[in-house]
């Protein structure tokens, strides 16, 4: 940021590492709760045709896939990975790639990824060989 | 060294409406995303539009979509964004940045990646 530009106090709409530099905004999937026909795939794609730029800059993607008795949802937004979501902390938040983890859930299936490339969100990814620390 | 200059702004009617610029000197404007972020006074910075070098996909901030439209000419190396029904809570200096491919992050200072800043006031 130019030098003049005054400094915010306690706001996190900008997030600076120990350089001040400033952190650009991610771009994510952002659908909240939409019906999905993701089912015993691989990978998925979101079918979310909307891209958001996240509010706050240091807020990473998230997808949850949840199938009942009645029905698959697929959702997308953005989130702080400091704080929870649905009660589970964020821990792949680093990863480029959205890598689906199920999580226990009474009465439902759940998994959830995060990630933090643009859109990484869309395109979901379940099979078992990208959950042993694949780089790709 | 690419610079980039904004100019466009001004003082405006709530309800009005104003074209800001973003000229970048230098050949690399086609290699960048761009952004137009503004910070009100007291503020911290909020990331109102960006716009792809390809193709110009764009994105909006829930503030501002319907209401503000960002393009961009690379044959002119300029950035735009019309700003329409414009409210009290626009009023803030807008500066344009540019983001390279897989950049998280841009230092404070680099002129050659942020604007010195426009500012639109939104007062009747």
């Known amino acids: 940021i130019p030098p003049h530009v005054q400094k915010s106090v306690n706001n996190d709409m900008m997030v600076t590492d120990n350089n001040g530099a400033v952190k650009f905004p991610q771009l994510c999937k952002f659908c909240d709760v939409r019906f999905s026909t993701c089912d015993n795939q691989k990978s998925c794609l979101s079918n979310c045709s909307i891209t958001s730029i996240c509010e706050k800059p240091q807020e990473v993607c998230v997808a949850v896939w949840r199938k009942n008795d009645e029905n698959i949802t697929l959702e997308t937004v953005c989130h702080d990975p400091k704080l929870p979501y649905h009660d589970f902390i964020l821990e792949d938040a680093a990863s480029p790639k959205c890598i689906m983890k199920e999580k226990k859930k009474p009465g439902e299936t759940f998994f959830m990824c995060s990630c933090s490339s643009d859109e990484c969100n869309d395109n979901i990814i379940f099979s078992e060989e990208y959950n042993t620390s694949n780089p790709d | 060294e690419v610079q980039l200059l904004e100019s466009g702004g001004g003082l405006v009617q709530p309800g009005g409406s104003l074209r800001l610029s973003c000229a970048a000197s230098?050949?690399?404007?086609?290699?960048?995303r761009m952004w137009w972020v503004r910070q009100a006074p007291g503020k911290g910075l909020e990331w109102v539009s960006?716009?792809?070098?390809?193709?110009?996909?764009?994105y909006y901030a829930d503030s501002v979509k319907g209401r503000f439209t960002i393009s961009r000419d690379n044959s002119k190396n300029t950035l735009y964004l019309q700003m329409n029904s414009l409210r009290a809570e626009d009023t803030a200096v807008y500066y344009c940045?540019?983001?390279?491919?897989?950049?998280?992050?841009?230092?404070?200072?680099?002129?050659?990646?942020w604007g010195q800043g426009t500012l639109v006031t939104v007062s009747s």
């Open positions: 940045a540019k983001q390279a491919p897989n950049q998280r992050y841009v230092a404070r200072g680099r002129l050659d990646y």
């Open positions: 230098g050949s690399t404007f086609t290699e960048y």
């Open positions: 960006a716009i792809e070098p390809i193709g110009h996909r764009t």
